[in-house]
Interface confidence: medium
């Protein structure tokens, strides 16, 4: 079989948007199954027609309604003949149109009066492609060959730039790039103390506007009174916008404020935020826990706990915990140093403990008091010790 791309030059140049019909002539076969191939891949196009010129001469058509850049490439036709694939001479389809941008100017954020560059590149065909730069509505500089780099010495306000690409088919305009001025960041906001203990505080905040420059760090300043002596200053890399303040004094009033910085410098500080560390839990356990049996139940008594340090704050109430070996257990809170215990089983051993609490929590538990089911009273001692008389 003889194959040729009919009347087709080796190169076929078509304007973008125009229709194209490629013709393939097959001689020496009665019923050729003509396939079209583009750049090595079979073309799945249902607009393929066949004309029988004679019994042994066929013409196949590949019809493209409106060519675009992606249709450009190397085309050939092929037929199966006796188990072998015969291919025609290729035709190079070139699609010409207005320039096509491969690189367009990008938005930038720059410090005032700092130099910067913008890039623009466009291709044909047809070549050559020339680039003209625009600053706002003003043309800057004469045509330059593509690709083109625009060097700008600096701007003092937000400015628009675009490029225009020209070739024999016409011109194309790029996107408009906005060059913003960088500025100092805005103050942070929503500053919250998220967790508090007697010596630590966790702080979180929302960053203000970054001034179009990446925020690099934030500073948390801590004082014991707004505007007082600085107790602590912590510089943290961001994100995340959080900080842990350590080694604070318990039960103390503090204030903190935060500012964040970008490459140009720091933001103003946010307003002071007051907070108070928690006090310490009581350090001592109640002493001399003992029990007195009565007809109505069991009276428990212990010695009052005196605060060891002012940081413990006011003490009280006391918390009493008791358990029996039948699994019964309970807790009760009492204001004084004496408690009347009811609801327990006198036939079972009883273990009692007491602690004193404050706003922070309960102090250490006292030595456990074991009240034996045989005792008329009980005394402190190791758990499971029994005293009877």
């Amino acid at each position: 079989a003889g194959l040729k791309l009919m009347g087709a030059p080796v190169k076929l140049t078509v304007s973008q948007g125009q229709p194209v019909k490629l013709n393939c002539s097959v001689e020496g076969m009665e019923e050729p199954d003509i396939q079209w191939v583009k750049d090595g891949a079979v073309v799945q196009n249902l607009d393929q027609l066949y004309i029988p010129v004679s019994e042994q001469h066929w013409i196949g058509f590949l019809s493209l309604k409106s060519v675009e850049r992606s249709d450009a490439g190397r085309y050939w036709c092929q037929v199966e003949d006796g188990g072998e694939t015969e291919i025609s001479q290729p035709v190079w389809l070139t699609v010409e149109g207005v320039p096509f941008f491969t690189v367009e100017p990008k938005d930038l954020a720059v410090p005032p009066n700092a130099p910067f560059q913008l890039s623009c590149e466009a291709v044909g065909p047809p070549e050559p492609v020339t680039i003209v730069w625009w600053r706002g509505t003003t043309k800057i500089g004469g045509p330059a060959p593509s690709p083109s780099v625009l060097n700008v010495t600096g701007v003092t306000q937000s400015t628009m730039f675009s490029c225009e690409a020209h070739n024999l088919k016409g011109l194309a305009s790029s996107r408009t790039a906005t060059v913003h001025l960088q500025a100092l960041p805005a103050a942070p906001f929503n500053i919250t103390v998220t967790k508090l203990s007697s010596s630590n505080a966790s702080v979180a905040w929302m960053p203000g506007a970054d001034g179009r420059a990446l925020l690099q760090s934030c500073t948390v300043q801590v004082t014991q009174a707004p505007g007082g002596w600085e107790v602590l200053a912590v510089v943290v890399p961001v994100p995340p916008f959080t900080c842990l303040l350590r080694d604070l004094v318990p039960a103390t009033n503090y204030s903190l404020r935060v500012r964040c910085a970008n490459a140009l410098g720091p933001s103003p500080y946010a307003d002071w935020v007051p907070f108070q560390t928690k006090g310490l839990a009581p350090a001592s356990a109640p002493q001399n826990l003992h029990a007195i049996r009565t007809d109505s139940g069991l009276i428990l008594e212990w010695e009052e706990v005196i605060p060891e340090a002012p940081l413990e704050g006011p003490l009280g109430p006391y918390k009493l915990s008791w358990v029996q070996d039948n699994g019964t257990q309970d807790e009760l809170t009492v204001e004084g140093t004496r408690a009347n215990l009811t609801g327990w089983d006198p036939q079972k051993d009883l273990i009692v403990r007491v602690c004193v609490s404050n706003a922070v929590g309960c102090g250490p538990w006292s030595q456990p008091l074991v009240v034996s089911s045989h005792d008329r009273a009980g005394q402190q001692g190791p758990p499971h010790s029994r005293t009877s008389w």
Epitope: E31, Q44, L46, D47, Q48, Y50, I51, P52, K65
Partner: antibody, heavy 125, light 108 residues
């Protein structure tokens, strides 16, 4: 004169298999493609797929891929549309169409000019 | 999957111009074809390759295509033109054909 003669109407139960046919005459069968088009009662036309001139290559619409098989016998100039397992939703009129391929007198393409009269398939339990 | 969108119905008086539109993303690249189907009959090709009239079709039928929209125009519609009209084209890669949903033309 170009003629496409389709097999007669058929009533089947869901799950049954079925093959309908389209016999071409009045032209060289291998000069053209054959397409199948479905039309459900009171609804529009749906392109199901086609088989090329040499019965060697088929193309299917996305909704029909895997559900039907298009084939052809060049020796009898007949195209076929086959179901392995019919569903009630297959109830429709099925047309075979002589598709683009060769051209009339080598000039004007006869795109989808010739349609068969249609085969009515009813699937009902 | 690819879709071609047509208005469900168009009404005109006899002698008026009827326009039926068909929109699809691939129409800038792929040709549109138009079919007429009268009640109980097989469809008949009216327009192929956007604007070419099929043999035996009256001159009052014309087609055009611009961007993603193809249009069938019937200049001076007749009562006998009352039918369903379908546009037909390929999806962008050319792997399969698609019919539009159809437009019922009423000539009152």
């Amino acid at each position: 004169e170009v003629q496409l003669v389709q097999s007669g109407a058929d009533v089947k139960k869901p799950g049954a298999s079925l093959t309908i046919s389209c016999q071409a005459s009045g032209y060289t069968f291998t000069d053209y493609w054959i397409s199948w088009v479905r039309q459900k009662p009171g609804k529009g036309l749906e392109w199901m797929g086609q088989i090329n001139r040499h019965a060697s290559n088929t193309m299917y619409g996305p909704s029909f891929q895997g559900h039907v098989t298009i084939s052809a016998d060049r020796s009898t100039a007949t195209a076929y549309l086959q179901w392995r397992s019919l569903e009630a939703s297959d109830t429709a009129m099925y047309y075979c169409v002589r598709s683009g391929g060769a051209t009339s007198g080598g000039t004007i393409p006869e795109y989808y000019q010739h349609w068969g009269p249609g085969t009515l398939v009813t699937v009902s339990s | 999957s690819y879709e071609l969108t047509q208005p469900p119905s168009v009404s005109v008086s006899p002698g008026q111009t009827a326009r039926i539109t068909c929109s699809g993303d691939a129409l800038p690249k792929k040709y549109a074809y138009w079919y007429q189907q009268k009640s109980g009959q097989a469809p008949v090709l009216v327009i192929y390759e956007d604007w070419k009239r099929a043999s035996g079709i009256p001159e009052r039928f014309s087609g055009s295509s611009s961007g993603t929209m193809a249009t069938l125009t019937i200049s001076g519609a007749q009562v006998e033109d009352e039918a369903d009209y379908y546009c037909y084209s390929q999806e962008r890669k050319g792997n399969y054909f698609v019919f539009g949903g159809g437009t019922k033309l009423t000539v009152l």
